[in-house]
């Protein structure tokens, strides 16, 4: 051990007054004193790997990760971050220690992760691992639970790194499909972190605290079920744990299960098997495939094979960053007044989204349902036939998505009228947007059939009330028209509505309200 170099890992926090991007070197900035990161040899690792205590910084913070090496002779080095190599310029301090730095300016989510520093000296080669994470500035967090195998036991531990400490529960169901809804009698809940009964059909773990509830389902391939028409797909982010369960039932114990990734058997230690007899004396076997922290090369087709069942596969896709895939083009709908209708958004997302539907500045709860093809759908039916603009908004920590909908309700116009000293105005909200006519009522035309050809000014859709278009028409009155009754009529394909106004009155005068359909 005394042959190994003496390594010191430090973090230097900078007072931000810069907007440059990160660089692997030293960089002049106002700095606080270096903070030791307790670099230690990583136990049981292949080669000499040192690890630094996890760095936790605020968004937009600027930091330097620095390594000081007491080793004779020259050193060469290379930084690697998310599979990209970054150049490295070591220098020597007054104590003749090798100094290697990585400056991260204006910390963002994309700059969080593992920074690997490879150092080569005349005596030895070694790696230093820095993990940089963004501190959650909000005091409370609720993180999606994940699974881990319990040491030396065939059991799963459910973990949610949340503040305040969450209540963790397993949600188990032995039925199929709809009967596994949360409040169904088929659902059993166990408020504990460790689960030993791993043979159930549907296994979920949920964590809840003041911020709400987050759940993770144990991804399962059931060889006794007819495969889905589309290949099941599982998304994970780099560094997350992968768990896939393969389940099969057979009349006796004479069958085995195996996992393959891209036609290659999984390595020892990446899977474990359990078996039990069911009540009707058939044998149930389950085989777990797991990776404690996935990398890009864990992407691929995971196939579960059995000597007595047709094999089935799932596509595991490892992404650097979460996503929400959906078409964001706005959609317009027109429906009848009593027609049943729901807005619908079809999307593919990872991690799972949180969403809201908004209408008239009011937010409505948003439900999402997983489809068989790997997509999810969120529907909103509670519009109560109110025309206007509806907004669907989704986010998952890594991505945001907004989609606009316009709902038009087909109905005949309804006219509102008002008059001032110089003009008369009528407005209507019917759909399709109405056209206008103005008629004069006189001795010659007691039924108000005499057209008023001049002084009319129509404004189609002149104001938008929460997306609801309103059409209006204004009559500028001449001296000759004062004291007369006029009639404004709005008409569309569904009917006509009129309002009569006395022109010398200062307010509305609904003398007669006609409806000619």
């Amino acid at each position: 051990n005394q042959d190994l170099p003496v390594i010191k890992c430090v973090l230097i926090n900078h007072k931000n007054n810069d907007s440059s991007v990160g660089k692997s070197s030293s960089y002049p900035m106002v700095s606080e004193s270096p903070e030791d990161l307790g670099c230690a040899l990583r136990p049981q690792s292949a080669g000499t790997v040192y690890e630094a205590a996890t760095v936790e910084v605020d968004v937009s913070a600027s930091i330097t990760l620095q390594v000081l090496v007491d080793t004779p002779g020259n050193i060469s080095c290379l930084w690697v971050f998310k599979h990209s190599s970054l150049n490295c310029q070591p220098h020597f301090d007054v104590q003749n220690r090798g100094v290697v730095s990585m400056v991260i300016l204006k910390m963002t989510e994309t700059q969080a992760g593992e920074y690997l520093l490879f150092i080569q000296s005349e005596a030895t080669n070694y790696t230093i691992v820095f993990t940089v994470s963004i501190r959650n500035t909000l005091l409370f967090t609720l993180r999606r639970p994940y699974f881990r195998k319990m040491e030396n036991q065939d059991a799963l531990v459910c973990i949610s790194e949340s503040v305040p400490e969450p209540i963790v529960e397993w949600v188990l169901c032995d039925s199929q499909g709809e009967s596994c809804k949360e409040e169904s009698p088929a659902v059993v809940k166990k408020e504990e972190k460790v689960l030993h009964e791993l043979f159930g059909t549907d296994i979920r773990c949920c964590a809840r605290n003041e911020l709400g509830r987050e759940c993770t389902r144990l991804f399962t391939i059931d060889l006794n079920q007819t495969p889905q028409t589309t290949l099941p797909q599982l998304f994970l982010k780099v560094g997350e744990p992968l768990w896939i369960r393969c389940k099969a039932v057979h009349v006796n114990h004479g069958f085995g299960l195996t996992w393959e990734l891209e036609n290659k058997a999984l390595e020892e230690g990446s899977y474990f098997e359990m078996s039990t007899y069911s009540t009707n004396r058939t044998m149930i076997r389950i085989l777990f495939a797991f990776v404690s922290s996935v990398a890009r090369n864990d992407t691929g087709y995971y196939t579960c094979s059995s000597s007595k069942h047709p094999s089935q596969s799932a596509l595991v896709t490892i992404v650097e960053k979460g996503f929400i895939n959906a078409t964001n083009s706005s959609e317009d709908y027109e429906i009848d007044q009593y027609e049943e209708f729901c807005f619908s958004v079809r999307f593919k997302a990872y991690p799972q989204i949180r969403c809201t539907w908004t209408f008239s500045r009011k937010a409505f709860p948003c439900e999402q349902k997983a489809l068989d093809d790997g997509y999810s759908v969120s529907k909103f039916c509670n519009h109560k036939h109110q025309p206007g603009e509806y907004i669907f908004h989704a986010e998952n920590g890594d991505a945001q998505f907004t989609k606009m909908f316009t709902l038009n309700i087909r109905r005949k116009p309804q006219v509102l009228a008002e008059a001032s000293a110089s003009q008369a105005s009528c407005s209507s909200d019917g759909y399709p947007l109405p056209s206008w006519t103005w008629k004069k009522c006189s001795d010659k035309s007691p039924n108000c059939t005499e057209d008023i050809p001049e002084g009319v000014w129509n404004r189609k859709a002149n104001r938008k009330v929460f997306g609801q278009w309103v059409s209006s028409s204004t009559l500028n009155m001449s001296e000759a028209m004062k004291g007369f009754l006029v009639k404004c009529c709005a008409y569309n394909s569904l009917g006509t509505s009129c309002e009569t106004i006395l022109l010398n009155s200062p307010g509305p005068f609904p003398f007669i309200q006609d409806s000619i359909s």
Partner: antibody, heavy 127, light 107 residues
């Protein structure tokens, strides 16, 4: 250079509350996953783990002393404070604070125990 | 709570001797165990972490082994400065617990 220094009263009367302060330097209780732990050692006896606190405010306490202990931190002063209520002569001991770095592996945190210790402060409980 | 039983509680040895100290956990603790050396009037000092990884700057005559419930600290050739009390610590589950200590004395 990483240092931890314990401070507090040398003498405490039975039933009183003991307040100990650990002032740290050379590392941060804000910018890295670091913990500070308290351990005590009665004269001629073994070490006993009391409590710890991490940069994310995660806390743990000794089962037998949980009802009497409170641990907190003041990051602006780089201090961790331990209070122990209802002191008794059997609580006479040297009280140490020590550092626990936290390391990441995927989604997990790993702790390898205490890597740097303070020199300790002797507390006597007597009327 | 996990109990850590250290044996022997004390031993006498000469400079150059090979010394072995054992620590037994009341339940499996993987390799979440450290060994600490304490000299009279001084704070403990970490020798080994993760059951077998040598702390930087600690002489290579110290070594650790074991996993699960049985752990061993070995000093391959005892030196004058090694006469001290040695403690094991489990940090697998809360509360963390120390062994009762092994005092290594000069024969």
């Amino acid at each position: 250079q990483v240092t931890l220094k314990e401070s507090g009263p040398v003498l405490v009367k039975p039933t009183e509350t003991l307040t100990l302060t650990c002032t740290v330097s050379g590392f941060s209780l804000i910018n890295a996953r670091m913990g500070v732990t308290w351990i005590r050692q009665p004269p001629g006896k073994a070490l006993e783990w009391l409590a710890h606190i991490f940069s994310n405010d995660e806390k743990s306490y000794s089962t037998s002393l949980k009802s009497r202990l409170t641990i907190s931190k003041d990051t602006s002063k780089s201090q961790v404070v331990l209070t122990m209520t209802n002191m008794d002569p059997v609580d006479t001991a040297t009280y140490y604070c020590a550092r626990i770095p936290g390391y990441s592996r995927g989604w997990d945190y790993y702790y390898y125990g205490m890597d740097v210790w303070g020199q300790g402060t002797m507390v006597t409980v007597s009327s | 709570d996990i109990q850590m039983t250290q044996s022997p509680s004390s031993l006498s040895a000469s400079v150059g001797d090979r010394v072995t100290i054992t620590c037994r956990a009341s339940q499996g603790i993987r390799n979440d165990l450290g060994w600490y050396q304490q000299k009279p009037g001084k704070a403990p000092k970490r020798l080994i972490y993760a059951a077998s990884t040598l702390q930087s700057g600690v002489p290579s005559r110290f070594s650790g082994s074991g996993s699960g419930t049985e752990f061993t600290l070995t000093i391959s050739s005892l030196q004058p400065e090694d006469f001290a009390t040695y403690y094991c610590l489990q940090h697998n589950s809360y509360p963390w617990t120390f062994g009762q200590g092994t005092k290594v004395e000069i024969k």
